[in-house]
């Protein structure tokens, strides 16, 4: 038949930072070619990748829809230049990935300082929003709109000349901190949902940023 | 279950240097903050430094700073406190303490703490 | 650094009584305010962050509150394993610091 030499796709992988999703696996294809299909826990299968030689399909669009929804996906293996023919009922060899619930799951994307501004011994330093592929009545979502006060910044700041480390949280994108007047700081900026246990509870920290430097202004 | 637990207390001279290991168990120290607290007899608690394993970054009480060095190991998922040039007034019970890292960073668990006594 | 000036440092009641301690911050900490427990040869016990949430597990009687920056601690119905030293905690900004204590003693 049709599907006796193609092999069933193996180590299924979600990758998912910032809900840019995407479904991995091997392996790399010889003569055979994948179909993914994606549904919720009650809903109904959805074909994405139609007969691909990749071994990846982005499933960002479908996951979007519901980031609270738990998906789970499942890859065809067809023989090479298979075409879909209405006659055939042999079910091709699949696999199932693990399942994704993409708001407890996606991975935190790396955090943008976006400035910081100095009035006498206040520093406001400001978190750039990512925008994110999620949408609510057509508008796109941004991290902080989709994950409310879930989602906090920790600040490490210190003084140029020092290596110890201060810290700030703010469940904003803004962080109002006390420094020494004529004292140059260095800023970096981490993205953590303190509710996870997880791994991706963290995200990995911004670049650092200094004063003196073009992203911050200094008022009396 | 999450479990803290120091080891490497003791005796020791003053200006000796001691090692105290702070194991974790039902979690991983490197997506958390780690805080090293002491208490000397009979008295309140006192911080004494915190190290981010994911980066690296400390800071330290300035009663200890440049003789207390903070380190993590990620893979033994277990912090250090490296104590140098010890003082009579460094005796006291030393815990650490896991930060849930969230606004308020309250010290959600914290090990049975570890005795440290400086005396010749 | 911020000082956190705890009050009363020891007090006496009654198995039922009401008690409240009160912690004081030097300047501003938003609601960055924790209360722990300490038993004799213990480590302190989280009861409640962000000034007035309690921890998970901790019995109702205990309460937390904040006005400006004054933070207090109640036991509405101090019971027989609550005799212990109290300890409030501001980390709102690096370096974290404690209140000196309250013991609650047995009258």
């Known amino acids: 038949s049709g599907t006796t030499n193609t092999v069933a796709a193996y180590n299924l992988t979600w990758k998912s930072t910032n809900f840019k999703t995407i479904l991995e696996w091997e392996p790399k294809p010889i003569n055979q070619v994948y179909t993914v299909q994606i549904s919720t826990k009650s809903g109904d299968w959805k074909s994405k990748c139609f007969y691909t030689a990749d071994t990846e399909c982005d499933l960002t669009d479908e996951i979007v829809k519901d980031v609270k929804q738990t998906y789970l996906a499942r890859v065809f293996s067809y023989p090479a230049g298979h075409v879909e023919s209405t006659g055939s009922t042999e079910e091709p060899p699949y696999e199932n990935s693990p399942e994704f619930t993409p708001y407890l799951e996606t991975n935190l994307g790396q955090p943008t300082i976006q400035s910081f501004e100095q009035v006498g011994t206040k520093v406001n330093v400001t978190v750039q929003d990512e925008w994110t592929l999620v949408r609510r009545n057509d508008t796109f979502l941004s991290l902080r709109d989709v994950f409310g006060k879930d989602l906090i910044y920790t600040l490490y700041y210190w003084k140029s000349s020092s290596s110890g480390k201060k810290t700030a949280k703010t469940n904003t994108n803004e962080f109002l901190i006390d420094v020494d007047k004529g004292e140059n700081y260095c800023f970096s900026v981490q993205a953590v949902i303190p509710s996870r246990r997880t791994a991706n509870r963290k995200s990995t920290d911004s670049p650092v940023e200094c004063m003196g430097h073009e992203k911050g202004e200094s008022r009396e | 279950e999450v479990q803290l637990v120091e080891s490497g207390g003791g005796l020791v001279q003053p200006g000796g240097s001691l090692r105290l290991a702070c194991a974790a168990s039902?979690?991983?120290?490197?997506?958390?903050?780690i805080h090293w607290v002491r208490q000397a007899p009979g008295k309140g608690l006192e911080w004494v430094g915190y190290i981010d394993p994911s980066n690296g970054y400390t800071y330290y009480a300035d009663s200890v700073k440049g003789r207390f060095t903070i380190s993590a190991d990620t893979s033994k998922n277990t912090a250090y406190l490296q104590m140098n040039s010890l003082r009579a007034e460094d005796t006291a019970v030393y815990y650490c303490?896991?930060?849930?890292?969230?606004?308020?960073?309250?010290?959600?668990?914290w090990g049975q703490g570890t005795l440290v006594t400086v005396s010749s | 650094d911020i000082q956190m000036t705890q009050s009363p440092s020891s007090l006496s009641a009654s198995v039922g009584d009401r008690v409240t301690i009160t912690c004081r911050a030097s300047?501003?900490?938003?609601?960055?305010v924790a209360w722990y427990q300490q038993k004799p040869g213990k480590a302190p016990k989280l009861l409640i962050y962000s000034a007035s949430f309690l921890y998970s597990g901790v019995p109702s009687r205990f309460s937390g509150s904040r006005s400006g920056t004054d933070f207090t601690l109640t036991i509405s119905s101090l019971q027989p394993e609550d005799f212990a030293t109290y300890y409030c905690?501001?980390?709102?900004?690096?370096?974290?610091?404690f209140g000196q204590g309250t013991k609650v003693e047995i009258k």
């Open positions: 303490a896991r930060d849930d890292q969230s606004v308020s960073s309250p010290f959600d668990y």
């Open positions: 039902g979690f991983t120290i490197g997506v958390y903050i």
């Open positions: 905690q501001q980390h709102y900004t690096t370096p974290p610091t």
């Open positions: 300047q501003d900490v938003n609601t960055a």
